[in-house]
């Protein structure tokens, strides 16, 4: 399987909420001994490899934000820790994997990475990640919404 990022750039005003999304593409093994570990973290555009550096999101590490579930299951972070920081990660039946960040501030701007690992009975088999940029802009009215786009094209849509 591969990970796709439907949008590579999210531009949001301060105070808004945003949902960053990654999507699993290709065949996903749903055997009884196959599980998936999914998480999010901040990074920087490295010289060699994007997403190689790991930084916390609002002081929460990749392990704090992870989901671990069977190939046929949906999941979301239910623990209070993430929600106290205005964060929630979720995964649905269709391969969509997201993190929602509430009440954005300028400090949330940066590169975000999703990581998906296929685990076959205790063994980490396949690791893939996706990257996207979040730009939080100051001084916009609270009525304005986030815009999501692919940097290489001019199309953009209003994001949740």
């Amino acid at each position: 399987f591969k990970v796709a990022t439907p949008y590579s750039l999210y531009v949001c005003p301060e105070g808004q909420n945003v949902t960053l999304t990654c999507r699993l593409l290709g065949p996903v093994d749903k055997g009884h001994d196959v599980t998936f570990y999914k998480t999010w973290y901040r990074s920087s555009r490295g010289e060699v490899q994007t997403c190689s550096e790991r930084r916390p999101i609002r002081n929460l590490t990749f392990q704090d934000l992870h989901l671990h579930h069977g190939g046929h299951q949906a999941a979301n972070t239910s623990h209070d820790l993430a929600q106290r920081h205005g964060l929630e990660s979720a995964s649905d039946h269709h391969g969509n994997f997201s993190i929602t960040m509430r009440n954005l501030t300028l400090l949330d701007s940066g590169l975000y990475c999703c990581l998906v690992v296929e685990i076959r009975h205790h063994h980490s088999e396949h690791r893939v990640h996706g990257a996207m940029e979040l730009q939080v802009q100051a001084g916009k009215g609270s009525g304005s919404t986030c815009m999501a786009s692919n940097e290489q094209d001019s199309d953009s849509i209003t994001a949740a």
Partner: antibody, heavy 121, light 106 residues
């Protein structure tokens, strides 16, 4: 905070059986494998087998088939290992360990304090 | 089964020294885990997936290797590092540990 609390030391007669418990707190017990490990002085660590509490699925090291039996009670978040037909070779510290998936890599992330089983006539 | 052979069995070092212990596998592995155990205590997760330090492990520890050969290195040994270190594979049943390397501090 994840904790695995094991039952206390046991002094057993040869030929008897013993049942060791491992109570888990602080995580979703049913979803992660519980591993059992044997340690004899000078023999290092030896994997006995594992149980997935939610399904009751088990895997055994061939060497311990017929010797160890795993069960789990999800209502009390407790896993059990029964050792049968005890001999002096079974005298050891037995650990339960909880699988942790860290950074996408499963490993023996959480350990009980160990249960000493002594087999003596 | 995959046999993990650790060497040396006992390693003696003075504080500040650099030490390396090795773990050789009888079959090629994708990665290796390491655990630290002190006398009278349970093993602790120490290095995961060959080279990644568990939370709270001092940066003087490092791990490396691939295939059948893996190693754990301490750049400057401290007294608190005295322990036995075990490598472990979770690639195939039965899951196995190495025999351990006991690190003694002079």
């Amino acid at each position: 905070q994840v904790q695995l609390q094991q039952s206390g030391a046991e002094l057993m007669k040869p030929g008897a059986s013993v049942k060791i418990s491992c109570k888990a707190t602080g995580y979703t017990f049913s979803r992660y494998w519980i591993e059992w490990v044997k340690q004899r002085p000078g023999h290092g660590l030896e994997w006995i087998g594992e149980i997935l509490p939610g399904s009751g699925s088990t895997n055994y090291n061939e060497k311990f088939k017929g010797k160890a039996t795993f069960t789990a009670d999800t209502s009390s978040n407790t896993a059990y290992m029964q050792l049968s037909s005890l001999t002096s070779e079974d005298s050891a510290v037995y650990y339960c360990a909880g699988e942790e998936v860290y950074d996408g890599y499963p490993w023996f992330g959480y350990w009980g304090q160990g249960t000493l089983v002594t087999v003596s006539a | 089964q995959i046999v993990l052979s650790q060497s040396p069995a006992i390693l003696s070092a003075s504080p500040g020294e650099k030490v390396t212990m090795t773990c050789r596998a009888s079959s090629s592995l994708s990665y290796m885990h390491w655990y630290q155990q002190k006398p009278g205590s349970s093993p602790k997760p120490w290095i995961y997936a060959t080279s990644n330090l568990a939370s709270g492990v001092p940066a003087r520890f490092s791990g490396s290797g691939s295939g059948t050969s893996y190693s754990l290195t301490i750049s400057r040994v401290e007294a608190e590092d005295a322990a036995t270190y075990y490598c472990q594979q979770w690639s195939s049943n039965p899951y196995t540990f190495g025999g351990g390397t006991k690190l003694e501090i002079k």
